[in-house]
Interface confidence: low
């Protein structure tokens, strides 16, 4: 038999475990007495379609409930072990009140409020972590989800959603808790060019070689489908047709915050006056998109020794 649980004085709605996709009527019984559970809404415990509703639940409602799906050729019976618990006195939520643990590896993650789809609820859903209301802008409640931006290990813990079920003009509270753990896994993100800065101007000497390195970070772990390349006047270096200007293959490196980055170096063997009028774009691309920083060259001013 399947198990369901709820808290005293809260709404609890359960479905027949045998239901599947059946559209046939469902009858519910107290398993120990075989007494039929009515469909009248005036009762605290009643049947509505395939659902058994406890509005509100009490500790003494705990027990095994039987549901029978009556179809023309076959009757299917399912059993549901319902346990109604007293509200825990402290913030430590016992394991028997926890829904399945969710594991997050994304930089941005969402937690779904368990069982909410069974209820006639209205937004907003309130969320708590370790019993404290979540008020940071990083935490956003939307529909039945809690979105967490920039997830870190500090976000691990027990998350409780609280919402209101409306029935027959009465509102009932429902709470559900699940654990969230952060998996240490790589992530991919929109590229960030760490060097050179946006709209940077670099000083060069005419006739001398010059190198411009462009570094971009793409996340943590794999940077497959990521690349850094240069364009000159919006033209890929290879198509620009200037042998003096070459692009060096990107090399892998890690930044101080453990991000995986790529560097591409644009090498000019001998800077000419013409090069000063060109626009050099460093492009960082991956599947998330593309970003560009434009660099210009400026003649290095001679040092005045007066």
């Amino acid at each position: 038999s399947k198990s369901s649980w709820g808290l005293e004085n809260e709404a609890l709605i359960v479905r027949c475990p045998q239901r599947g996709r059946s559209t046939y009527p469902v009858e519910w019984y107290y398993s120990d007495t075989n007494e039929s559970i009515p469909t009248q809404k005036r009762n605290r415990i009643f049947v509505s379609r395939d659902r058994l509703k406890f509005l509100p639940a009490r500790v003494e409602d705990s027990g095994i409930y039987a549901c029978v799906i009556r179809s023309p050729n076959l009757n299917k019976t399912g059993y549901l072990n319902v346990t109604i618990h007293k509200k825990p006195p402290s913030c430590n939520i016992p394991d028997y009140l926890m829904y399945s643990t969710v594991r997050g590896s994304d930089k941005n993650f969402k937690i779904t409020c368990p069982t909410i789809d069974l209820y006639n609820w209205t937004a907003p859903v309130q969320w708590f972590k370790n019993c404290k209301a979540l008020q940071e802008p990083r935490f956003r409640a939307h529909r039945s989800y809690l979105f967490i931006d920039n997830v870190t290990h500090d976000d691990e813990g027990d998350y409780t959603c609280q919402f209101t079920h409306a029935e027959n003009g009465t509102n009932y509270i429902v709470t559900a808790t699940r654990s969230f753990t952060v998996e240490e896994k790589g992530f991919s993100m929109f590229p960030v060019i760490t060097n050179p800065p946006y709209n940077h101007t670099m000083e060069v000497e005419i006739g001398k070689p010059a190198s411009i390195a462009c570094s971009a970070c793409f996340g943590k772990g794999s940077h497959f489908l990521a690349d850094v390349l240069w364009q000159i006047n919006k033209t890929v270096v290879g198509n620009f047709g200037e042998a003096r200007i070459q692009e060096e293959e990107g090399r892998n490196e890690s930044s101080s915050n453990d991000m995986d980055c790529l560097t591409s170096v644009l090498r000019i063997t001998g800077v000419t006056e013409k090069d000063l009028s060109l626009e050099y774009d460093c492009l960082a691309l991956n599947l998330h998109g593309m970003i560009r920083h434009t660099i210009r060259l400026r003649r290095k001013q001679p040092i005045d020794h007066r």
Epitope: L225, A226, D227, L229, Q231, N233, K234, T235, V236, V237, G238, N239, E247, E249, G250, L285, N286, L287, H288, G289, M290
Partner: antibody, heavy 118, light 107 residues
């Protein structure tokens, strides 16, 4: 003359495979980003895939991801598109194009027709 | 993905007419917009890149303008060989996306 020449198109059954080739001439192929763009009969242009000069960066439209593979052989100046698990909606003229100014497709091949039908 | 919307989807014009086609991006794409011409049974041909830069060899009657989200391709004096379908394409972010095309027909 700068040129791209596609080949490998044809009639294939749904679920089948094809490999398109694009031979490049008269430009620095190994440094050029290359792309495939397709056009279904009577429809507009749809970008399919792209690959960086050294082949390290490859990109795909969501509609072909996991089914198509872009690759290149710089020693042969040739671009490829391996198409697996073909569907009727993949029926189109497939063009290979060089990615040039501003990410524009500045050189195009004449196209090769792929028909997916049973 | 950035959506590109062209208008009109088709237009009828006469030789010598001034023709304007607009392209709107669903978000700002700076000046990273390209225009192509395609004739029936042929491959597209790049006309304008970077919103307003005329590709080498393209007649000067073609011009492009705009920045951000709104762009325009203008043919100052329509010639018989200009009857074709025109596409805009953004290269600001991956994936590159095209407008649905504008067919320029003879009136």
């Amino acid at each position: 003359e700068v040129q791209l020449l596609e080949s490998g198109g044809g009639l294939v059954q749904p679920g089948g495979s094809l490999r398109l080739s694009c031979a490049a001439s008269d430009f620095n192929f190994k440094n050029a980003w290359m792309s495939w763009v397709r056009q279904a009969p009577g429809k507009g242009l749809e970008w399919v895939s792209a690959i960086s000069g050294n082949g390290a960066g490859t990109y795909y439209a969501d509609s072909v991801k996991g089914r198509f593979t872009i690759s290149r052989d710089n020693s042969k100046n040739t671009l490829y598109l391996q198409m697996n698990s073909l569907r009727a909606e993949d029926t189109a003229v497939y063009y290979c194009a060089r990615v040039g100014e501003t990410g524009a497709f500045d050189i195009w091949g004449q196209g090769t027709t792929v028909t997916v039908s049973s | 993905d950035i959506q590109m919307t062209q208008s009109p989807s088709s237009l009828s014009a006469s030789v010598g007419d001034r023709v304007t086609i607009t392209c709107r991006a669903s978000q700002s794409i700076s000046s990273y917009l390209n225009w192509y011409q395609q004739k029936p049974g042929k491959a597209p041909k790049l006309l304008i890149y970077d919103a307003s830069s005329l590709r080498s060899g393209v007649p000067s009657r073609f011009s492009g303008s705009g920045s951000g989200t709104d762009f325009t391709l203008t043919i100052s004096s329509l010639q018989p060989e200009d009857f074709a379908t025109y596409y805009c394409q953004q290269s600001y972010s991956t994936p590159p996306t095209f407008g649905q095309g504008t067919k320029v027909e003879i009136k």
